[in-house]
Amino acid sequence: LQDLCSNCPAGTFCDNNRSQICSPCPPNSFSSAGGQRTCDICRQCKGVFKTRKECSSTSNAECDCISGYHCLGAECSMCEQDCKQGQELTKKGCKDCCFGTFNDQKRGICRPWTNCSLDGKSVLVNGTKERDVVCGPSPADLSPGASSATPPAPAREPGHSPQ
């Protein structure tokens, strides 16, 4: 049996109360695909949400988070409070990263500093709450007499300028 409603276009619904003719979606509702028997209610961006894209007859509204919050979940289903760099959000609010950990973003958790010694390297720049450590060459590379990766430049003869 063919669906009599399958050809009602997006932005409309197949109106059973009017002998299955296509009717436009009422205000504050939408249908993003054709052949719908009802229109969906538009999402409202309220409270910590702000409107990124208005609802139309064929597409739902899209929300963002207000300043000081960031989106979580599919289609920004939740807003989470921002923290400063060097902090993470806990149940009690924003807390500084513990020693040995860092967070370089306004969201997410504090992560441990890189352990340079695991790669046989040394710490070039110490870590902070906001930044990871920077690993440098291994201590062996820095010891006297270690062979250099670049050969020494050839000596020039006196009185000769370079080509």
Epitope: D3, N7, P9, Q20, I21, C22, S23, P24
Partner: nanobody, 121 residues
Framework: EVQLLESGGGEVQPGGSLRLSCAAS????????MGWYRQAPGKGREFVAA???????VYAESVKGRFTISRDNAKNTVYLQMSSLRAEDTAVYYC???????????????WGQGTLVTVKP
């Protein structure tokens, strides 16, 4: 309330032409398919032509190449241009609002009251 009002019928000689109009109101015309049907004396109602909101058209074999269906969404009106008319085209012509914007296997949700077309020498 849905209203469909046909006009343009009359008497014409074989080989002649007529243009039927159907003025629609009470619904969103531009998103719905419209059709023309006819009923000859002593016979059942039969499909003639239909046009979708997107302007796809379908015709009965008996009128293909002779009749043209069109629509003007700004005027909420559907037309049936009939040419090379034959005696067997004599019938009451009805405008129909089709269910679900369908022109394939169409089903009529609302009918007009009809306009008579008579083809005779």
């Amino acid at each position: 309330e849905v209203q469909l009002l046909e006009s343009g019928g009359g008497e014409v000689q074989p080989g002649g032409s007529l243009r039927l109009s159907c003025a629609a109101s009470g619904f969103s015309f531009s998103i719905n398919a419209m059709g023309w049907y006819r009923q000859a004396p002593g016979k059942g109602r039969e499909f003639v032509a239909a046009i979708e909101s997107g302007r796809n058209t379908v015709y009965a074999e008996s009128v293909k190449g002779r009749f043209t269906i069109s629509r003007d969404n700004a005027k909420n009106t559907v037309y049936l241009q009939m040419s090379s008319l034959r005696a067997e085209d004599t019938a009451v012509y009805y405008c129909g609002l089709l269910k679900g914007n369908r022109v394939v296997s169409p089903s009529v949700a609302y009918w007009g009251q009809g306009t008579l077309v008579t083809v005779k020498p």
